[in-house]
């Protein structure tokens, strides 16, 4: 059929609750493209009728709710003027009652369901809620061992649960719950999270060194594509996170809809005394709004930024 297969994504999901998956793959989906969802190599596209339990909502496939029989491979076909790409999504639906048993026995749970708090620190858990804008999400409630979390040490901040002065007792099974409203109907979203406690310092006990960038500006023409590496050295046993942020937000979250600016996949080279990590940021198309904004590379407690600048006019051309 002339479509190029890009990748396979595996998702393990809970039955009886809403689920959505967004078909995005920059730079392919950043241009003028059409997106169509199919199930199990069917030639018939997923319905776009919003009353259907399973339907396509713009680039998303939306299950309201997910059911046991929905397991299978779904294809998202991205057609451009001269191209065709296909993403495969393998959905496995399981029956899960978070309060009945531990989620420890479930296979290959994603990192969204396994989170870490740092002993003695102020830290946070994240409730991962990925839905199209047609879905209105009610206030998030947090539970530990099936009891609603209350107390001075806890604050709900958007999709986060802030935990101050983390103690060993904070380990355990958590869940975040929200009511999703779509076309006048309400559905419950409940995400279970297994929380472990680490005694390591909040950022791995080491101070990573950012080799590049060095808090400087980069001259770049409007409309061009730009890739900037963040190079970091750190101890071999570190637990530091490395990422790019803008406006105090992960770039992948900040540009969640447009995908115009993305963080790359981290790579590292191992040396005898340390590791050298590289994580890049890709600007598919530099826009005016990007100039003058600090794009921050974070590595544990270390930060460094780049600021994009318009090149100075070349007066020799006149």
């Amino acid at each position: 059929d002339g479509c190029k297969d890009i990748f396979m994504k595996n998702e393990i999901l809970s039955a009886s609750q809403p689920f959505a998956f967004n078909c995005t793959f920059p730079p392919i989906t950043s241009g003028e493209v059409s997106v169509t969802w199919y199930k199990n190599s069917s030639k018939i596209p997923v319905s776009k009728i919003i009353q259907s339990r399973i339907h396509q909502d713009e680039t998303w496939i939306l299950f309201l709710p997910m059911e046991w029989g929905d397991s299978g491979v779904y294809q998202c076909v991205i057609k451009g003027r001269d191209s065709c790409h296909r993403i495969h999504v393998n959905l496995t639906v399981f029956e899960k009652h978070w309060c009945d048993t531990s989620i420890g026995g479930l296979p290959n749970l994603s990192d969204e369901y396994k989170q870490i708090l740092h002993l003695g620190k102020d830290d946070s858990l994240t409730c991962h809620l990925h839905f199209p804008k047609s879905c209105v999400l009610g206030p998030i409630k947090w539970y530990k061992d099936c009891n609603e979390i209350k107390g001075e040490r806890f604050t709900v901040l958007e999709t986060r649960l802030l935990v101050s002065n983390v103690s060993a007792e904070d380990r355990g099974n958590y869940a975040c719950q929200a009511i999703l409203t779509h076309s006048g109907k309400q559905y419950e979203v409940l995400n279970g999270i297994t929380v472990s406690i680490t005694e390591r310092a909040g950022y791995g006990g080491s101070v990573p060194k950012i080799i590049y960038p060095k808090n400087h500006s980069i001259e770049v023409q409007l409309g061009t594509t730009l890739i900037v590496d963040c190079n970091v050295t750190d101890t071999k046993d570190n637990t530091n996170l490395r990422c790019w942020r803008v406006n105090n937000t992960l770039v992948d979250d900040y540009y969640d809809e447009s995908k115009r600016i993305r963080e790359g996949v981290e790579t590292h080279v191992s040396f005898r005394e340390h590791n050298l990590y590289t994580v890049n940021i890709t600007f598919l198309e530099v826009k005016m709004e990007d100039y003058g904004l600090p794009f921050m590379c974070h590595a544990g407690v270390s930060t460094a930024y780049i600021i994009l600048q318009l090149p100075a006019p070349d007066f020799r051309a006149y």
Epitope: K121, D122, D123, S124, K133, C135, V136, L137, E152, R153, T155, L157, E158, T159, R160, L162, S164, G202, N247, N248, T249, L250, D253, Y255, D256, E257, S258, E289, L293, P294, M296, H298, V301, T303, Y305
Partner: antibody, heavy 117, light 107 residues
């Protein structure tokens, strides 16, 4: 819960420097997020002044940038605002607030600063 | 800077009425739109973040929608405790900016 308390003089003379401090309880300002100052002149709308992030980097509203400095004292879990060369137009209620990934999620109750000789 | 234009600047409605406030951005803000409620002499309180997510403790009569440059905020059944000024705010591009506010009063 994360809570805020703004403090500082309620009256500042024109051309002087306005200084305010925000004391945060319930969460360390070095753990995450951006810690902001926002102001509201009497009977008017809201204006974002700037922030200091958990890592210590700052960002200011260009309209005030030349006059604003935001610093922090991590030992006291406080961040501070200095606004130089004030005029009557700087008379406002000044709020401190935490910004999550999307919004100014929680605010202090605000402190009114009047610029007058 | 991104300009945020709110309308109307004030409105008067009866208890139980459906009330709608609109907010228009001068450029696409990609759903990075928040709504706040401010009562006289108090700090603003977050109601809705990222276009369609209700903050902790916010009742379901507050209903948001919108995308691109145009956003709306609806109170399905106005209650006496909803008397306040409502502000929209964009969190897409620095400097973060607010709408001029909509004052909601009871008839």
């Amino acid at each position: 819960d994360v809570q805020f308390q703004e403090s500082g003089p309620g009256l500042v003379k024109p051309s002087q420097t306005l200084s305010l401090t925000c004391t945060v309880t319930g969460y360390s300002i070095t753990s995450d997020f951006a810690w902001n100052w926002i102001r509201q002149p009497p009977g008017k709308g809201l204006e974002w002044i700037g922030y200091i992030s958990y890592s210590g980097d700052t960002n200011y509203n260009p309209s005030l940038k030349s006059r604003v400095t935001i610093t922090r004292d991590t030992s006291k879990n406080q961040f501070s605002l200095k606004l130089s060369s004030v005029t009557a137009a700087d008379t406002a209620t000044y709020f401190c607030a935490i910004r999550g990934p999307y919004s100014f999620t929680y605010w202090g109750q605000g402190t009114l600063v009047t610029v007058s000789s | 800077d991104i300009q945020m234009t709110q309308s109307p600047s004030s409105l008067s409605a009866s208890v139980g009425d459906r009330v709608t406030i609109t907010c228009r951005a001068s450029q696409d803000i990609n759903n990075y739109l928040n709504w706040y409620q401010q009562k006289p002499g108090k700090a603003p309180k977050l109601l809705i973040y990222y276009t369609s997510r209700l903050h902790s403790g916010v009742p379901s009569r507050f209903s948001p929608s919108g995308s691109g440059t145009d956003y709306t905020f609806t109170i399905s059944s106005l209650q006496p405790e909803d008397i306040a000024t409502y502000y929209c705010q964009q969190g897409h591009t620095l400097p973060w900016t607010f709408g001029g506010g909509t004052k909601v009063e009871i008839k």
